[in-house]
Interface confidence: low
Amino acid sequence: EVEKTACPSGKKAREIDESLIFYKKWELEACVDAALLATQMDRVNAIPFTYEQLDVLKHKLDELYPQGYPESVIQHLGYLFLKMSPEDIRKWNVTSLETLKALLEVNKGHEMSPQVATLIDRFVKGRGQLDKDTLDTLTAFYPGYLCSLSPEELSSVPPSSIWAVRPQDLDTCDPRQLDVLYPKARLAFQNMNGSEYFVKIQSFLGGAPTEDLKALSQQNVSMDLATFMKLRTDAVLPLTVAEVQKLLGPHVEGLKAEERHRPVRDWILRQRQDDLDTLGLGLQGGIPNGYLVLDLSMQEALS
């Protein structure tokens, strides 16, 4: 807390400029009018204030706006934003995407700080949903942003926003998140033709059910092994050898290298060995010829 002292004669700030960097903390407190600071916030960024001096400037704004800063001030905070606490930011009402971009720029290149996370949370809640422009902006600054949301939070993402998602934005998503995102992507891309649709939907297929994989196998998509290995095991297990062969196309050769890993390993265990042999890849571990396969899950469903 800076002690209240009278401003020395001739030191009253008429504008926010470089001369203020030579002011002591108490002089800044006494000689800079908070309303002047608020109207000239855009100048603060260009002046190399010390962290201690920034603390004083923040204190003056806090006194002027105890209920939270107006957006006109927030937009021009610049590196003073780094001095804000999540508690400060919770008082703000940020509605402009330009304001959000300006503040994200300050934190660019760093991990999402608690301040930034709170800012994004306030902004998204204010908008009511993660619209396309917001998602575009957030994933540009933080490619992992989408995968940092809980499945519950992802459920508020409208299908139209999915167009903004790039494959790298989904790199760190887990199956539960893809379960939520996949139906939205399917809806978003539903009017595209086969090959274009596959290019767009590919990154989301970790959330696809068996029936969609069966449908894709009829479309000559040539899924690569990296995508296949990210599919849900429970979605892959019911696929026949012929369906997997069609789904992977020329990439089917890669099954041999992955035969000990999920979901390939579990899928092999469910296939007849003579069906696997038709692939000519030397895949072993299928159900021996002559054995009867009982689908107990189907029997339970019927009883």
Partner: nanobody, 118 residues
Framework: EVQLVESGGGLVQPGGSLRLSCAAS????????MGWFRQAPGKGRELVAS????????YYPDSVEGRFTISRDNAKRMVYLQMNSLRAEDTAVYYC???????????WGQGTQVTVSS
């Protein structure tokens, strides 16, 4: 109620190693990111490592990159900080912290003292 309890601090010589542990209870760990912060006397809290609970995305500031490693065991609800090549400037109280995804670090442990001195 969320509880974070750190252990593993102590006195170590420069160049030595320590492994800090943080036991978490009272929440579904998968919905949280975890971090380690430190606070040296007279200084503010500094984030030294964080890890995303959905994946293994980690973050380290330049001051500890290559020396510190954060890891987690979701099943045991544990978070670890392996600190190698320790320096005198690493002396601080180290805090374990947790956050809900998309929010600031809101849950803190009591801290464990790490002193690097010969």
């Amino acid at each position: 109620e969320v509880q974070l309890v750190e252990s593993g601090g102590g006195l170590v010589q420069p160049g030595g190693s320590l492994r800090l542990s943080c036991a978490a209870s009272g929440f579904i760990s998968n919905f949280y990111a975890m971090g380690w912060f430190r606070q040296a006397p007279g200084k503010g809290r500094e984030l030294v490592a964080s890890i995303n609970s959905y994946s293994d995305i980690t973050y380290y500031p330049d001051s500890v990159e290559g020396r510190f490693t954060i890891s987690r065991d979701n099943a045991k609800r544990m978070v670890y900080l392996q600190m190698n090549s320790l320096r005198a400037e690493d002396t601080a109280v180290y805090y374990c912290a947790a956050r809900w995804q998309g929010q600031g670090f809101g849950y803190w442990g009591q801290g464990t003292q790490v002193t690097v001195s010969s």
